[in-house]
């Protein structure tokens, strides 16, 4: 039985040309996280494996930052970046947990910045 | 020319362990992960595990764990796998593949020519 | 685990003819799927990677398709060489990489 439970950043903003961090929180289970990967729509953009570490996609490499922690930094943000984000854990033996971060990318500078995740 | 040259077939018994060589030319070894498949008399694929010939770092599928050893050798451009406490069910061909730059992920581009492993009593 | 399911297991065709080949992932793997060649007594051949691109020296008359949870492998017209078993494989989640069941293509 599937018994944990994603927290994410929820809905955040962050200026063009700015960074930001996507972070999800997996807890409320004793599943061991194998997997996480990081995903904006139907593209892979970074994976973070157990065994073998962080992998981040070509087509991102030069944008995308792993970490903090099993989190994801997005860097050089332009407006074609806003939209949905999802963390997928891949846990056994519990299965597969998904988080949705939305993020809206401000041409202006007055980007109210969503409240900070904090993990314990 | 790239190639994955396997060593030859072995017949073993019950409560044995194996040992089978994959050793890799015509490319940058330690660029690429390696991985390990193995496939029963008449039946699918099964994936066993990778190996990224950089660092020594190891992945094993669940079935295998602490039954399974994947190392390699740089200096000869070999990786190794080796299966313990051997069963009829593990009668199989081993294949080792190499998979996509230790930087990202990809298929299974090249091949050994397989290994056959018979368990027998 | 993701689990790969193919369909059918066999399929009798004629050469010359249209062969679609089928397969489903229980989760999205995104495009991040390969199809493979196996013929009895060889190692398997890579012949699509990234769901639709075709690898190196394999024939026009291969193509895939399909994206998250779908994927299909197309022969356009059947050659005798092409008589084999064709596997699909996702590669984004491991552990374990998974790959489907199997596909044999045979002479009708």
């Known amino acids: 039985m599937m018994t944990g439970t994603i927290e994410t950043t929820g809905n955040i903003s962050a200026e063009k040309g700015g960074s930001i961090i996507l972070q999800c929180h997996l807890s409320s289970t004793t599943a061991q996280v194998t997997q996480v990967n990081w995903e904006q729509q139907d593209q892979l953009l970074a994976i973070c494996n157990a065994d073998l570490g962080w992998h981040i996609s070509p087509s991102f490499k030069d944008r995308v930052a792993p970490g903090p922690g099993l989190g994801l930094t997005l860097q050089s943000l332009t407006v074609n970046d806003t939209g949905e984000y999802f963390c997928i854990y891949h846990t056994y033996p519990d299965g597969t947990y998904t988080g949705r971060i939305f993020l809206e990318v401000l041409e202006s500078s007055v980007a109210e910045h969503g409240a900070r995740f904090q993990i314990p | 020319q790239v190639q994955l040259v396997q060593s030859g077939a072995e017949v073993k018994k019950p409560g044995a362990s194996v040992k089978v060589s994959c050793k890799a030319s015509?490319?940058?070894?330690?660029?690429?992960?390696m991985h390990w498949v193995r496939q029963a008399p008449g039946q699918g694929l099964e994936w066993m595990g990778i190996i990224n010939p950089s660092l020594g770092l190891t992945s094993y599928a669940q079935k295998f764990q602490g039954r399974v050893t994947m190392t390699r050798d740089t200096s000869t451009s070999t990786v190794y796998m080796e299966l313990s406490s051997l069963r009829s069910e593990d009668t199989a061909v081993y294949y080792c593949?190499?998979?996509?730059?230790?930087?990202?992920?990809?298929?299974?581009?090249?091949w050994g020519q397989g290994t056959m492993v018979t368990v027998s009593s | 685990e993701i689990v790969m399911t193919q369909s059918p297991a066999t399929l009798s065709v004629s050469p010359g003819e249209r062969a679609t080949l089928s397969c489903r992932a229980s989760?999205?793997?995104?495009?991040?799927l390969a199809w493979y060649q196996q013929k009895p007594g060889q190692a398997p051949r890579l012949l699509i990677y990234?769901?639709?691109t075709r690898a190196t020296g394999i024939p026009a008359r291969f193509s895939g398709s399909g994206s998250g949870t779908e994927f299909t492998l197309t022969i356009s017209s059947l050659q005798s060489e092409d008589f084999a078993v064709y596997y699909c494989q996702q590669y984004v989640v491991w552990p374990p990489l998974t790959f489907g069941g199997g596909t044999k293509v045979e002479i009708k």
């Open positions: 593949a190499r998979g996509g730059r230790t930087t990202w992920i990809g298929a299974f581009d090249i």
């Open positions: 015509g490319y940058t070894f330690p660029a690429y992960y």
């Open positions: 989760q999205s793997v995104s495009s991040n």
């Open positions: 990234g769901a639709s």
